[in-house]
């Protein structure tokens, strides 16, 4: 009679995380008696996965009923596979011994590879806002995937970016991997509505890559442009001066009027108009009583935007001259701002 052989027909098995792995094993003889055991790995540090004789292995079920007459099928199923289950599994026949069973024959082993999907990419931008023409860094992270091969791309508004660096860790063999990428993006004034997208492609995703996004509205600060103009006389000895605050983002803005350097009024931008590019416009009015001034008046519109140092624009009001429309030469576009009288 030929000596018992342990046959593991599959050199390798590939299973998606969360699924059930079937590890096949058959013996060629019913003799000798003794239990089958399954191990992950070889040598003294091997891990017991299943023992036919005793023990409780909740994730493991046998494919066949081992109590069946003439059974020689010792295949097992391992449920709810995770990347940590990857490794080489050996089906080992033991011969009955006293007091302990003796290892008799081992199968050649089956390598279990686990395909695990990457986690949804998380894109994070800089901690502080930056202004147009500045370069900012975005990071993208995804974890828990296997095998190691993965592709990461960056896009800004659908256009692929090229200035980025990517690392996959660890470098050596592991049950699962992580990817970390940093992309550099140059901001423009039109980027309030822009998006930066990190796209991850992996064999487990079947051609449907995962995407993580960051809105540049969280990153960009577009400083305002100021224009101070004098409006036509509204009443004898009264002059209307407006401060047009244009193309700013985010909305957080405080405006202060100064008359000859003295604070006249402070207000916070509330009812603003939004431009197509996502920036805001706002207009503030100041009614100046000319008769109250003997000398020329220097009116200053001072704006503190998003906690940044104040910017200002001044306008000289000649008291000696008969009130008429005066103004700075700044070209003003017709913004359709929501104008408010301020008294």
């Amino acid at each position: 009679e030929e000596e018992l052989q342990v046959i593991q027909p599959d050199k390798s098995v590939l299973v998606a995380a969360g699924e059930t792995a079937t590890l096949r094993c058959t013996a060629t003889s019913l003799i000798p008696v003794g239990p089958i055991q399954w191990f992950r790995g070889a040598g003294p540090g091997r891990e017991l996965i299943y023992n036919q004789k005793e023990g409780h292995f909740p994730r493991v079920t046998t494919v066949s009923d081992l109590t069946k007459r003439n059974n020689m099928d010792f295949s097992i199923r391992i449920g709810n596979i995770t990347p940590a289950d990857a490794g080489t599994y050996y089906c080992v026949k033991f011969r009955k011994g006293s007091p302990d069973d003796v290892e008799f024959k081992s199968g050649a082993g089956t390598e279990l590879s686990v395909r695990a999907k990457p986690s949804a990419p998380v894109v994070s931008g800089p901690a502080a806002r930056a202004t147009p023409q500045h370069t900012v860094s975005f990071t993208c992270e995804s974890h828990g995937f296997s095998p190691r091969d993965i592709t990461l791309k960056w896009f800004k508004n659908g256009n692929e970016l090229s200035d980025f660096q990517t690392n996959v860790d660890p470098v050596g063999e592991s049950v699962s991997y992580s990817i970390h990428s940093t992309a550099k993006v140059v901001l423009t004034r039109e980027d309030v509505h822009s998006q930066v997208i990190c796209e991850v492609a992996h064999v487990t995703l079947q051609g449907d890559p995962l995407r993580g996004t960051a809105n540049l509205s969280e990153t960009i600060r577009v400083p305002p442009t100021l224009e101070v103009t004098q409006q036509p006389v509204r009443a004898e000895n009264q002059v209307n001066v407006t401060c047009q605050v244009r193309k700013f983002y985010p909305q957080r803005l405080q405006l202060t009027w100064l008359e000859n350097g003295n604070v006249s009024r402070t207000e916070t931008a509330s009812t603003v108009t939004e431009n197509k590019d996502g920036t805001y416009n706002w207009m503030s009015w100041l009614l100046v009583n000319v008769s109250a001034h003997r000398d020329d008046v220097k009116l200053t519109c001072q704006v503190e935007h998003d906690g940044q140092p104040a910017v200002s624009k001044s306008h000289d009001l000649k008291v000696s001259a008969h009130p008429k429309e005066q103004g700075s030469n700044t070209a003003a576009e017709n913004t359709g701002s929501n104008e408010r009288n301020i008294y």
């Epitope: 019913l30 003799i31 008696v33 004789k53 005793e54 009923d65 109590t67 007459r69 003439n70 009955k96």
Partner: antibody
């Protein structure tokens, strides 16, 4: 040491009852083993009585003549096998052996107790 | 029920003899047969399982063969300690048919010639 030790035998009157025990040591009951009772009347051959799966299922099997009168059971926490014998007859007089059936029984009865004598007589 | 018939019921032999004992099952039991040796006042001892598997610690002069309904136990060279009674047993199990059978044969007494 791996062994089986029977107890509970003795003299009993016809129609009486007796419970035999078999304490296992050196191994744990599991579904890999069937635990069995075999008897041998004085000067006669071996006669199979009953077996029980020593694992979770605890399924039991009886010789046709033993069904209804004999009940096999086990307590895995105590690693002990039992045989409850009711309505005993003179022909039940025998040495009762406890045995371990290896590999679901297919591997033969590889471990035996020393036996306990049951005498049914008035 | 499955019946096991052993023959001969007794035999006389000398040390060094080749001894053959046969066992017949009333229906096919594949290779699910065991052989035991029993000496007076002692519990039986397993010699052969699955018709031909030699139990650990049993001398190699004992061998088993057969399948289906006809089985043989052979002692290639009888030794003084081999004089005893030998039993065959069906170890059929129940899972396929519900027909659990662990019946023993009637025994064969091997005596000194």
């Amino acid at each position: 040491e791996v062994q089986l030790v029977e107890s509970g035998g003795g003299l009993v009157q016809p129609g009486g009852s007796l419970r035999l025990s078999c304490a296992a040591s050196g191994f744990s009951f599991s579904s890999y083993y069937f635990m069995c009772w075999v008897r041998q009347a004085p000067g006669k051959g071996l006669e199979w009585v009953a077996c029980i799966d020593a694992g979770y299922s605890g399924g039991s099997h009886y010789a046709s003549w033993a069904k209804g009168r004999f009940t096999i059971s086990r307590d895995n926490s105590k690693n002990t096998l039992y045989l409850q014998m009711n309505s005993l007859r003179a022909e039940d007089t025998a040495v009762y052996y406890c045995a371990r059936a290896y590999e679901y029984g297919y591997g033969g009865y590889d471990l035996w107790g020393q036996g306990t004598l049951v005498t049914v007589s008035s | 029920d499955i019946q096991m018939t052993q023959s001969p019921s007794s035999l006389s032999a000398s040390v060094g003899d080749r001894v053959t004992i046969t066992c017949q099952a009333s229906q096919s039991i594949d290779s699910n047969l065991a052989w035991y040796q029993q000496k007076p006042g002692k519990a039986p001892k397993l010699l052969i399982y699955r018709a031909s598997g030699l139990e650990s610690g049993v001398p190699s002069r004992f061998s088993g063969s057969g399948s289906g309904t006809d089985f043989t136990l052979t002692i290639s060279s009888l030794q003084p300690e081999d004089f005893a009674t030998y039993y065959c047993q069906c170890t059929y199990g129940s899972n396929d048919s519900g027909n659990y059978a662990n019946a023993f044969g009637g025994g064969t007494k091997v005596e000194i010639k």
